[in-house]
Interface confidence: low
């Protein structure tokens, strides 16, 4: 349904409100060096002109794009060359190509301070001195850091972030009632980002079938009883929101999110009997809930997958008429028949029938080319079983902290050339799946470890892109999205490498680091473990744990001296120099 | 399974102190939030203080702010309340109790109880 | 401080009597960041340390019976026994989570007839 003036149409779908928070979303995802205060004037100019629009559709450039009119009011920044040098080129260019222009600019890891949260106090004096203002930033801040947040959901924390000031600062204990509250939204808010930045990876990279076949997998496991054509109709209108929201079309995507939660509630019956609740949510609480809802049991007697995709006559000619289709009521049928499955596992193995049926149904005797298809799942079914059994054990040995130490010296070096942080980081989130998936049963490990291992390596392909150093990470991040994991996975030492020159420097520390937090603390060691993996990659287990634990110690000896600046000065070359000594250096 | 065993308790003059203690084991104690709640002879029950054991954040009622501080061992999985100037109506069953990881003002396990008594 | 009102002092009910058990608060308990209320009931039996029943005013604590039930939203609060048991003898404590102190009703006695 075409309207006349888009901008209008957004504006009234989506409310002021909604509609002025969702243009600084946009804005803050392209511009993410701009000061908050310019940001601001901008978004205000914005809804400014879409008011006139609202009361005269026919009034002059109501009748742009929503691409042209953004992309205007971002190119008529004045630092914009400065600041962001040649991201400036864009705004020469012509809609689409500018758009597309500002989304490869898009920074995923932009060079911004750390967030430091201030004192409840403070907090709480600047939510009631000015609310708007207060929640307007927030939105701002993670915007900016987090260039592919999902806008919509960004929305929902922003109203819980609300709610949290509201409710703790007049609290007896601010914070006790508020800390926990935004260590809470920081925590989900990082999950949400590096999840929705699979997703975007997923349709920028791999396109739209990819994406499609990821949400018939995981659609079709949450509602098992849903008909294939009704699935296929949700899998259509969310490849649309999603679509929307990488592209950085962020007002249309929060509106068709909105219509796609009221569909689904009109339709429940014939969806999930478990969205009853959700349904009676208000919007944002509702779409989100529907997300994340859990999966409907599975219908009763469902017939044998056999019937249908190995023994029938036609299968082949199914297949001829409508591959995707086919392929696509396959994955439904086995998702829904597997919560217990990864979904990358699931596409794994729609992959493998795929390539079966292209090689059988060319054959002399089709049928008896693909009989024993399923015969082929065993092995990769059984791989990430294996993998996910042997890390659980490990880390219910070990502890988080010892686990992601195990994963950092194995990620290191297999992939040494990749930069420390980056390595430290992705390290620190792999090693999570411990504490986040081995605590449950064997039926919901697979689903929960290895789709949140495909979020973050994601993480670590996003990382590398921006500066690549390493083929094997590129060959494994570019060739199949569903084995990332795998192709990790199967990576051995990197026998290419040319060990790091030692610098001491590096292996010097300072007295600040007995103020930092644990958390803080724990990444200068794995900093200091990554960094000596890159210098003697052959070092045992032994070595390094015997390394370690000398730093260990050395840390908390300087942190309780009196002189502690002059004790890390002068331990720390001892320490060095046995360090050097024990692993040959 | 889920183990909260406090120990500690005693008689103790008025003005007397006191140092209670609570071993944890069973789940992964960094991430929870653990209180002490107490319980007069045959009155009901009566929170006093709590801690997240992740930060350390803490908070009391104000029947006991300024007198008892509450503190833990993360590498030990022990939580402490340490009682100064007692007073004869601190007198009780002290129970440590496990709140839930975001929604702390449940608790979930409990301990079996010290008995404080403070009396001349 | 919230301050939390139980109703009755005591009870007395034979086996397979429903009991109702009810709690009031002096102000709305319901979290602004989740639209749910944070009402736990606890049940103390004699000689024996609080076990959780039920927490959100009616979710059920695992491993409880389903003969126990939460109700109410805001400020009013029900807890039911649908049919009592020898077992169920005890006193029953609801109790506030939403903000500190965390503040327990005075206690419902329940007896065996």
């Known amino acids: 349904d075409a309207h006349k003036s888009e901008v209008a149409h957004r504006f009234k779908d989506l409310g002021e409100e909604n509609f002025k928070a969702l243009v600084l979303i946009a804005f803050a995802q392209y511009l993410q060096q701009c000061p908050f205060e310019d940001h601001v004037k901008l978004v205000n100019e914005v809804t400014e002109f879409a008011k006139t629009c609202v009361a005269d559709e026919s009034a002059e450039n109501c009748d742009k794009s929503l691409h042209t009119l953004f992309g205007d009011k971002l190119c008529t920044v004045a630092t914009l060359r400065e600041t962001y040098g040649e991201m400036a080129d864009c705004c020469a260019k012509q809609e689409p190509e500018r758009n597309e222009c500002f989304l490869q600019h898009k920074d995923d890891n932009p060079n911004l301070p750390r967030l430091v949260r201030p004192e409840v106090d403070v907090m709480c004096t600047a939510f009631h001195d000015n609310e708007e203002t207060f929640l307007k930033k927030y939105l701002y801040e993670i915007a900016r850091r987090h260039p592919y947040f999902y806008a919509p959901e960004l929305l929902f924390f922003a109203k819980r972030y609300k709610a949290a000031f509201t409710e703790c600062c007049q609290a007896a204990d601010k914070a006790a009632c508020l800390l926990p509250k935004l260590d809470e939204l920081r925590d989900e808010g990082k999950a949400s980002s590096a999840k929705q930045r699979l997703k975007c990876a997923s349709l920028q990279k791999f396109g739209e079938r990819a994406f499609k076949a990821w949400a018939v997998a995981r659609l079709s496991q949450r509602f098992p009883k849903a008909e294939f054509a009704e699935v296929s109709k949700l899998v259509t209108d969310l490849t649309k929101v999603h679509t929307e929201c990488c592209h950085g079309d962020l007002l249309e995507c929060a509106d068709d999110r909105a219509d796609l939660a009221k569909y689904i509630c009109e339709n429940q019956d014939s969806i999930s009997s478990k969205l009853k609740e959700c349904c009676e949510k208000p919007l944002l609480e509702k779409s989100h809930c529907i997300a994340e809802v859990e999966n409907d049991e599975m219908p009763a007697d469902l017939p044998s997958l056999a019937a249908d995709f190995v023994e029938s006559k036609d299968v082949c000619k199914n297949y001829a008429e409508a591959k995707d289709v086919f392929l696509g009521m396959f994955l439904y049928e086995y998702a829904r028949r597997h919560p217990d499955y990864s979904v990358v596992l699931l596409l794994r193995l729609a992959k493998t029938y795929e390539t079966t049926l292209e090689k059988c149904c060319a054959a002399a005797d089709p049928h008896e080319c693909y009989a024993k298809v399923f015969d082929e799942f065993k092995p990769l079914v059984e791989e990430p079983q294996n993998l996910i059994k042997q890390n659980c054990e490990l880390f219910e040995q070990l502890g988080e902290y010892k686990f992601q130490n195990a994963l950092l010296v194995r990620y290191t070096k297999k992939v040494p050339q990749v930069s420390t942080p980056t390595l430290v980081e992705v390290s620190r989130n792999l090693g999570k799946v411990g504490s986040k998936c081995c605590k449950h049963p064997e039926a919901k490990r697979m689903p929960c470890a290895e789709d949140y291992l495909s979020v973050v390596l994601n993480q670590l392909c996003v990382l590398h892109e921006k500066t690549p150093v390493s083929d094997r990470v590129t060959k494994c991040c570019t060739e199949s999205l569903v084995n990332r994991r795998p192709c990790f996975s199967a990576l051995e030492v990197d026998e290419t490498y040319v060990p790091k020159e030692f610098n001491a420097e590096t292996f010097t520390f300072h007295a600040d680091i007995c103020t930092l937090s644990e958390k803080e603390r724990q990444i200068k060691k794995q900093t200091a473990l990554v960094e000596l993996v890159k210098h003697k990659p052959k070092a045992t287990k032994e070595q390094l744990k015997a390394v370690m634990d000398d730093f260990a110690a050395f840390v908390e000896k300087c942190c309780k001296a009196d002189d502690k600046e002059t004790c890390f000065a002068e331990e720390g070359k001892k320490l060095v120099a046995a360090s050097q000594a024990a692993l040959g250096l | 399974e889920v183990q909260l065993q406090e120990s500690g308790g005693g008689l103790v003059q008025p003005g007397g102190s006191l140092r209670l203690s609570c071993a944890a084991s069973g789940f992964t104690f960094g991430r929870y939030w653990i209180h002490w709640v107490r319980q007069a002879p045959g009155k009901g029950l009566e929170w006093v203080s709590g801690?997240?054991?992740?930060?350390?954040?803490?908070y009391y009622a104000d029947s006991v702010r300024g007198r008892f501080t509450i503190s833990r061992d993360k590498a030990k999985n022990t939580l402490a309340l340490t009682m100064n100037s007692l007073k004869s109506e601190d007198t009780a069953v002290y129970y440590c109790?496990?709140?839930?990881?975001?929604?702390?003002?449940?608790?979930?396990?409990w301990g079996q109880g010290t008995q404080v008594t403070v009396s001349s | 401080d919230i301050v939390m009102t139980q109703s009755p002092r005591s009870v007395t009910a034979s086996v397979g009597e429903k009991v109702t058990i009810n709690c009031k608060s002096s102000q709305s308990v319901v979290s602004g960041s989740n639209q749910k209320s944070l009402l736990n009931w606890y049940q103390q039996r004699p000689g024996q340390s609080p076990r959780l029943l039920i927490y959100?005013?009616?979710t059920r604590e695992s491993g409880v019976p389903d003969r126990f039930s939460g109700s109410g939203s805001t400020t009013d609060f029900t807890l039911t026994i649908s049919s009592f048991q020898p077992e169920d003898v005890a006193v029953y404590y609801c109790?506030?989570?939403?903000?500190?102190?965390?503040?327990f009703g005075s206690g419902t006695r329940l007896e065996i007839k």
């Open positions: 109790a496990k709140g839930g990881i975001v929604y702390f003002g449940a608790y979930d396990s």
């Open positions: 959100l005013a009616s």
């Open positions: 801690i997240s054991i992740g930060d350390g954040t803490t």
């Open positions: 109790q506030q989570g939403y903000g500190t102190p965390f503040s």
